[in-house]
Interface confidence: low
Amino acid sequence: TGADTEAVVCVGTACYTAHSGKLSAAEAQNHCNQNGGNLATVKSKEEAQHVQRVLAQLLRREAALTARMSKFWIGLQREKGKCLDPSLPLKGFSWVGGGEDTPYSNWHKELRNSCISKRCVSLLLDLSQPLLPSRLPKWSEGPCGSPGSPGSNIEGFVCKFSFKGMCRPLALGGPGQVTYTTPFQTTSSSLEAVPFASAANVACGEGDKDETQSHYFLCKEKAPDVFDWGSSGPLCVSPKYGCNFNNGGCHQDCFEGGDGSFLCGCRPGFRLLDDLVTCASRNPCSSSPCRGGATCVLGPHGKNYTCRCPQGYQLDSSQLDCVDVDECQDSPCAQECVNTPGGFRCECWVGYEPGGPGEGACQDVDECALGRSPCAQGCTNTDGSFHCSCEEGYVLAGEDGTQCQDVDECVGPGGPLCDSLCFNTQGSFHCGCLPGWVLAPNGVSCTMGPVSLGPPSGPPDEEDKGEKEGSTVPRAATASPTRGPEGTPKATPTTSRPSLSSDAPITSAPLKMLAPSGSPGVWREPSIHHATAASGPQEPAGGDSSVATQNNDGTDGQK
């Protein structure tokens, strides 16, 4: 599968497994699914801590991961065509296993809207910082990876398996080894809670002697919401150790008989359960009558009880269950208020960040600030947003309108801007003329020059800056364009229908490009723009005059 289970944490009614292996999100989900789970949800701070713990287990010691940042898939995805919803904590993403739009989120940074492809979420771990329960892994969204191409995939993933309930780990009263096999095919000898339908293999004895005994148990549902192994009495008991080994495997008290045998007992106020090991309280709160995080408080003399809710919750009409108090009704925030279980949090709209005077205040994010501008050229900050602009000769481009693209003025929508030859450059253009013609002072038109078979005028050569048009005599056939000041190929002309009769012969000549009259004093490096041209003196159909050129990389007809 490309992934190995290397860590497992079971808590509450779920187990989380962490895996390393460069899989796509789809492959990771398939791996979890094969064992009856899904990519993990992170629906609360508590769940985030469970996931953090299993990742910490996976990444301990000299992990193979050498990168400073590491990512692990979780089950949060957004389908192609579904757009970002900034008003929701999950921003329009949803959990792969289904379920409601949960209030907890921990995004790494502001999400950019893009609906054109499926997006998947991973947990971002900064390996240069220690994990703390207060510093939970951030959520990072991005492409979902490609099956079969490890280079495009991230370091691992986390699965979640949910169960009806859990059994307590088996307690041994003497030497032995317990091996649990879970329904999701993980074996472990150390689980805090063991999921329903797991098997436990108990090998009693010292391990290096022949006198080992084996027991096999299943974690079963004994009664609604009551799960146990169906074992009776401590396991692997040994007269040699009595109560000295692991308290005889007893939950509370261990009482030894004279012959090395022993029994488990319970402290005052507790009773021994059917497994003859575990103790449960006798008081009315022991049946956990309070729900939804409510605490059971014993009344006088232990006869009755009341339920008490934690801060941010209140009892419902049954007086047994806690319901969340909606603190947002008091409008405590400047912009967005998100009611959370037991509290609330203030959020800022896209384009704003927490800050400014007062609790829950927001201030504008200066997206154009030095070092963080998303724009290729000009950036203007606005309240809650920004917009990009481009220098003259460029237009906004890119999916998000932050890039600038050169305008090819020579093939612009208004038709050619020059009467004869047009040289596109980065951010600008120049006009030129055919042999025998010179550029008029307006820099666009061509006028008849002194009779000459010189080359067309165009951008200057390194050596020829300032030379008069038409002052050289052409020599050879289709030569490469000369190179400009920075050593990049210079522009070759695009011809437009000249406003002159095209019966002047065109000789085979290198295009020695000269400065057009009226060209700006500052040289702007042009990009290559080839003319589609014949290589000899001829008259193309339609009466167009063409200039023969060939690029030095052997391509033609493309910019």
């Epitope: 010691r61 390996l127 910082q129 994990l131 150390s190």
Partner: antibody, heavy 122, light 107 residues
Framework: EVQLVESGGGLVQPGGSLRLSCAAS????????MSWVRQAPGKGLEWVSA????????YYADSVKGRFTISRDNSKNTLYLQMNSLRAEDTAVYYC???????????????WGQGTLVTVSS | DIQMTQSPSSLSASVGDRVTITCRAS??????LAWYQQKPGKAPKLLIY???SLQSGVPSRFSGSGSGTDFTLTISSLQPEDFATYYC?????????FGQGTKVEIK
Amino acid sequence: EVQLVESGGGLVQPGGSLRLSCAASGFTFSSYAMSWVRQAPGKGLEWVSAISGSGGSTYYADSVKGRFTISRDNSKNTLYLQMNSLRAEDTAVYYCARDGSRIYFPDDLDYWGQGTLVTVSS
Amino acid sequence: DIQMTQSPSSLSASVGDRVTITCRASQGISSYLAWYQQKPGKAPKLLIYAASSLQSGVPSRFSGSGSGTDFTLTISSLQPEDFATYYCQQHYTTPPTFGQGTKVEIK
């Protein structure tokens, strides 16, 4: 081979200062949180302070908070403990130790130095 | 702070004996527990991490178990080089805390 070597211990008067150093080798120093643990003569182990791999996060026991400062120089692979306003009860062998995990704090301490004795006495 | 209580504080045993040391946390610490061995004049040495995982290079006669609040270090067959003081340490939360130690002496 992972090695941690402490230095800088010695005799100091109450109220005085001392700076301990711990030179690390054999592993990528900047990837690991590091801790100082002390042991008073004939007593058990007491965690004193810790610092994250990057040096961005520091942690202290209440007994030394405000008096001791932990720092590190990742370019020199060295951990430091600046001890000010020393008291008689700070007398102990001070060990520098590596946190066993690159990712979780606090963690077990998988490699220890040989220790350096600090005696605070008038 | 989480208190760690070890028992017994000292014990006498013979080579070949099975020795069990227990450590109890004042609150649940999941499996975030380590065991160390310290010999006189030497630095502590990590034996067990994550309650039951054997540190690389440590003999297999050492084993750890437990979860939550109750933990056990077992030496299945005591060897001469195992006479030392053993400490448990929780690393569930800051500050990490150690047990007071259990001294294993020759009977």
